[in-house]
Interface confidence: low
Amino acid sequence: DPVKPSRGPLVTCTCESPHCKGPTCRGAWCTVVLVREEGRHPQEHRGCGNLHRELCRGRPTEFVNHYCCDSHLCNHNVSLVLEATQPPSEQPGTDGQ
């Protein structure tokens, strides 16, 4: 059940986000989340994950990229990119060449 907290061993992760109480946190896995809100520059947050492991398997989009790893401080030097904005879909009636 992805909603239940992990029962596995904990790892120490780099913590860099508004929620951090210090430079590291402890969790079931480490995370890096790159988020771009409308009209703003992308923000990268580093921290720990305990719930919703399924987010780790999500594909990057133009708005969010969610990275997870499972070893000590493994999120420290990770840099993420967002997917490039998709080009407008071709208009009906064109042959795409």
Partner: nanobody, 121 residues
Framework: QVQLVESGGGLVQSGGSLRLSCAAS????????MGWYRQAPGKQRELVAA???????NYADSVKGRFTISRDNAKNTVYLQMDSLKPEDTADYYC???????????????WGQGTLVTVSS
Amino acid sequence: QVQLVESGGGLVQSGGSLRLSCAASGSIISINDMGWYRQAPGKQRELVAAITRGGTANYADSVKGRFTISRDNAKNTVYLQMDSLKPEDTADYYCNAVGLLRGGYWYEDWWGQGTLVTVSS
């Protein structure tokens, strides 16, 4: 937000037994690791025994075969059965829990106030 209440410490003769217990309360979603640490006068705090939510235990070499850690997940309680106590076991014993609070983003460390165990020769 979280309270760890320890009990069971006291004075005991060498070779005797004590049972420590520690109950965690508060806005807790889940506790992962629970354990006991001890600190003798003039020494650093050291791990005595710890146990995961799944029941996997590990012990300091100095207490293996004498101490047994167990826990009740439903009650967020951890126990330390201490047998064949020695004078060198004399210390303040601290309960530790690593858990996730409601509204929390990751696990946090919580500590009890400590309970004194004195083993006389």
